[in-house]
Amino acid sequence: ADLGSMGYFELQLSALRNVNGELLSGACCDGDGRTTRAGGCGRDECDTYVRVCLKEYQAKVTPTGPCSYGYGATPVLGGNSFYLPPAGAAGDRARARSRTGGHQDPGLVVIPFQFAWPRSFTLIVEAWDWDNDTTPDEELLIERVSHAGMINPEDRWKSLHFSGHVAHLELQIRVRCDENYYSATCNKFCRPRNDFFGHYTCDQYGNKACMDGWMGKECKEAVCKQGCNLLHGGCTVPGECRCSYGWQGKFCDECVPYPGCVHGSCVEPWHCDCETNWGGLLCDKDLNYCGSHHPCVNGGTCINAEPDQYLCACPDGYLGKNCERAEHACASNPCANGGSCHEVPSGFECHCPSGWNGPTCALDIDEEFGLVPRGSGHHHHHH
């Protein structure tokens, strides 16, 4: 399965010294039958390459068995002894190249892993003599060394030195999480993105860091306009405030009242809660007709009745819907100077004799105006 990797175990061989140019068996690399104890191996140097086996932690290392964490090998690196550039920037570049299938430093072995890095491991490093005519077998083994330990993912290299039976090896190792993988076990995934599946970058720990305008665990939720009432409004893109049905206003904090509501408002949508002194389904019925219209005259007391209705309680001597009519208006003889009193629906009228005028015939025309009265001189007074 093409899974990609969560991380890499990297081994950079720095030096190998096999001063006698011999195999672990004691034979010479050139295979002429002589051994070092029979006069040394001078004619032909070893063609040394390295094989690396990575497996689970073993307190007592067994060189056989599967390389459960991975396996790698170098090309032929040199003869009996050689030195390679130390791991560092070159190794980093090589690792990047190796992931894209390009040329890499010959002494670098990169073993990708697709599981949570367990931190503890066993490393078995073998130096072999390359022989074109044979497949690798124990006869061509120069040296086998092993290391069981713990390593956490980091950029720094850890140096290891081995003095084996015939060879001395110096190497550096490290574990690095792949791009988009984080944590001490390289199993925390975070890949920056800016689409409907999330709008985020990743911090150094692999946590999603929401881009401006986005929030939530996956940074999929838009941050609405500041002040937007999220109980009654929301947004799918940042900076907006879209109201739920029944709500309105810039911040979706105003309910929509019942259509046609006149003197009322709402706390819940589609309600029409009447203002003081208003009633009816649309709050269009005046419950305080008295206070807003003052219809009673002549000292009448106004009493609110049904919506838009009222009653006038009239004082003695007055009647009518608004107490506008005087009862027995002529009983008090209001007309002076011989005027005659006549009751009319609106009160009384004084019919004044010649020379007098006014509502109660109290005005002397000659004194007031210096004029002779015109007409009959009668006057209607509406009391």
Partner: antibody, heavy 123, light 107 residues
Framework: EVQLVESGGGLVQPGGSLRLSCAAS????????IHWVRQAPGKGLEWVGG????????DYANSVKGRFTISADTSKNTAYLQMNSLRAEDTAVYYC????????????????WGQGTLVTVSS | DIQMTQSPSSLSASVGDRVTITCRAS??????VAWYQQKPGKAPKLLIY???FLYSGVPSRFSGSGSGTDFTLTISSLQPEDFATYYC?????????FGQGTKVEIK
């Protein structure tokens, strides 16, 4: 060569269940999203849901939420669409599609699609 | 959900014509719009992503433009293999939504 192959479609009764598979090859499965898009006969395209196989994050269209479940098996490079409580309106050709994404671009595109598998919900 | 409204729903054109299809989003979707081509009985094919970027292998006669709410797909010189249905899709906010499609037919 990038390939997506759907399977598992067929005729099912209303209320029944079906599981569609989307076998992926030719690319690193965990580096992309896999989405399911359907197309009712003679109609347009409708997104059903998607998954990010690397972390299992999923999302669904409101019309299928609670009825459909998307999962992925990274060891098999396969995404699944488990469809329960099927309705007549779920009848469609179901496509799986690979969705690439890059933080340098706002939005993304579904760059590879399977051939589609027909699901018919009828009694 | 964000609505994507395509226009026209269909058009007739001749080989060599310049064809323009528009897509309007109900809300701002930045540049998160992709365009697809679909032929009968086949899966859709990606043409344009992020509003204006031509997908690898797509002929340069196809181009996309726009941001915010208004987007355009242009075919500079229509070829016989371009007769198909075209869909826009926003991928800015969940759920991603498609336009209803524009069918390009031979005049």
């Amino acid at each position: 060569e990038v390939q997506l192959v759907e399977s598992g479609g067929g005729l099912v009764q209303p209320g029944g269940s079906l599981r569609l598979s989307c076998a992926a090859s030719g690319f690193t499965f965990t580096s992309y999203d896999i989405h399911w898009v359907r197309q009712a006969p003679g109609k347009g395209l409708e997104w059903v849901g998607g998954i990010s196989p690397a972390d299992g994050d999923t999302d669904y269209a409101n019309s299928v939420k609670g009825r459909f479940t998307i999962s992925a098996d990274t060891s098999k490079n396969t995404a699944y669409l488990q469809m329960n409580s099927l309705r007549a309106e779920d009848t469609a050709v179901y496509y799986c599609a690979r969705n690439d994404y890059d933080v340098r671009f706002v939005g993304s595109g579904m760059d590879y699609w399977g051939q589609g598998t027909l699901v018919t919900v009828s009694s | 959900d964000i609505q994507m409204t395509q226009s026209p729903s269909s058009l007739s054109a001749s080989v060599g014509d310049r064809v323009t299809i528009t897509c309007r989003a109900s809300q701002d979707v930045s540049t998160a719009v992709a365009w697809y081509q679909q032929k009968p009985g086949k899966a859709p094919k990606l043409l344009i992503y992020s509003a204006s970027f031509l997908y690898s292998g797509v002929p340069s006669r196809f181009s996309g433009s726009g941001s915010g709410t208004d987007f355009t797909l242009t075919i500079s010189s229509l070829q016989p293999e371009d007769f198909a249905t075209y869909y826009c899709q926003q991928s800015f906010t969940a759920p991603p939504t498609f336009g209803q499609g524009t069918k390009v037919e031979i005049k």
